[in-house]
């Protein structure tokens, strides 16, 4: 009955500080409504980093000034962060909420550690 | 540093209504989902209701169902349950609590006692 | 709606003595578990999440286990501050039920 979520131990951002990975939830119930929230963990502190609920089968919106984008299929969620830099680089945890019908369901990754090295500035050049 | 203060107990006759208030700050209050939890003198924990960050979903307790409703202001960073048609059994202290991002309550208030009794 | 059952109800024990209590869920919550501590006249405090994640501040004595359905919180060596009651919470899924409690006592 409990709900499981799988999510990558480790992802490498892109030179453009993107990241992408997939967030998947065994589901113990026939749910419509799904919201997906990534957190960061940074020592103690647990922050949200961006939320989006959506309808099975429908796509994922977040907001607009979000940092994240994302796809959905299934119990299957793609999920990319834009934007990051050497600092932004933690555990990132994928939260799933089972939202509608009842019962309410939760389920947490055990977090994806997303390393993001900042490009080198390129050499001036005569 | 966070904070949650209870307000709007008091002694009430059974059948009769009471509004309570939880006033949150030291937090972004319209990020979290707060519950109410309940303990009757002398006895243990008991959940009643939540409401979500937003207001956009609702649960509560079977013994509660019907008669009481949570609601929030964000704008007043402010918490609320109306209870209606009280009864004895409802008699306890009544805490509002944080649902952390990860799950659990990890702030409460300090309770308000709600009698009711004729 | 997920039961939880706690064992014992009441302790007494010594300073200084390994304290254990269990929590049955009365279905697999994973590690969905919360444990509490409500001193006599004060209010519940989270102690440990996720079953055995340490609460920030909370002293490295408290430790908690399992997965599914059983848990256990342990008190490896008990002091005068920790008499209190000890509640374990599901939040898995609605309700977030509570178990009924264990008292702790010293001797």
């Known amino acids: 009955k409990a709900m499981h979520v799988a999510q990558p131990a480790v992802v490498l951002a892109n030179s453009r500080g993107t990241a992408s990975f997939v967030c998947e939830y065994a589901s113990p119930g026939k749910a419509t409504e799904v919201r997906v929230t990534v957190l960061r963990q940074a020592d103690s502190q647990v922050t949200e980093v961006c939320a989006a609920t959506y309808m099975m089968g429908n796509e994922l919106t977040f907001l607009d000034d979000s940092i994240c984008t994302g796809t959905s299929s299934g119990n299957q969620v793609n999920l990319t962060i834009q934007g990051l830099r050497a600092m932004d680089t933690g555990l990132y945890i994928c939260k799933v909420e089972l939202m509608y019908p009842p019962p309410y369901y939760m389920g947490i990754g055990n977090g994806t550690q997303i390393y993001v090295i900042d490009p080198e500035p390129c050499p001036d050049s005569d | 540093q966070v904070q949650l203060v209870e307000s709007g107990g008091g002694v009430v006759q059974p059948g009769r209504s009471l509004r309570l208030s939880c006033a949150a700050s030291g937090f972004t209050f319209s990020s979290y989902g707060i519950h109410w939890v309940r303990q009757a003198p002398g006895k243990g924990l008991e959940w009643v209701a939540v409401?979500?960050?937003?207001?956009?979903?609702?649960y509560y307790a079977d013994s509660v169902k019907g008669r009481f409703t949570i609601s929030r202001d964000n704008s007043k960073n402010t918490l609320y349950l109306q209870m209606n048609s009280l009864r004895a059994e409802d008699t306890a202290v009544y805490y509002c609590a944080r649902g952390s991002l990860l799950g659990p309550f990890d702030y409460w208030g300090q309770g308000t006692l709600v009698t009711v009794s004729s | 709606d997920i039961q939880m059952t706690q064992s014992p109800s009441s302790l007494s024990a010594s300073v200084g003595d390994r304290v254990t209590i269990t929590c049955r869920a009365s279905?697999?919550?994973?590690?969905?578990l919360a444990w509490y501590q409500q001193k006599p006249g004060k209010v519940p405090k989270l102690l440990i999440y996720?079953?055995?994640t340490l609460q920030s501040g909370v002293p490295s004595r408290f430790s908690g286990s399992g997965s599914g359905t059983d848990f256990t919180l342990t008190i490896s060596s008990l002091q005068p501050e920790d008499v209190a009651t000890y509640y374990c919470q599901n939040y898995n899924s609605a309700p977030w039920t509570f178990g009924q409690g264990t008292k702790v006592e010293i001797k």
């Open positions: 409401i979500w960050y937003d207001g956009s979903n609702k």
């Open positions: 996720a079953a055995s």
């Open positions: 279905q697999g919550i994973s590690n969905y």
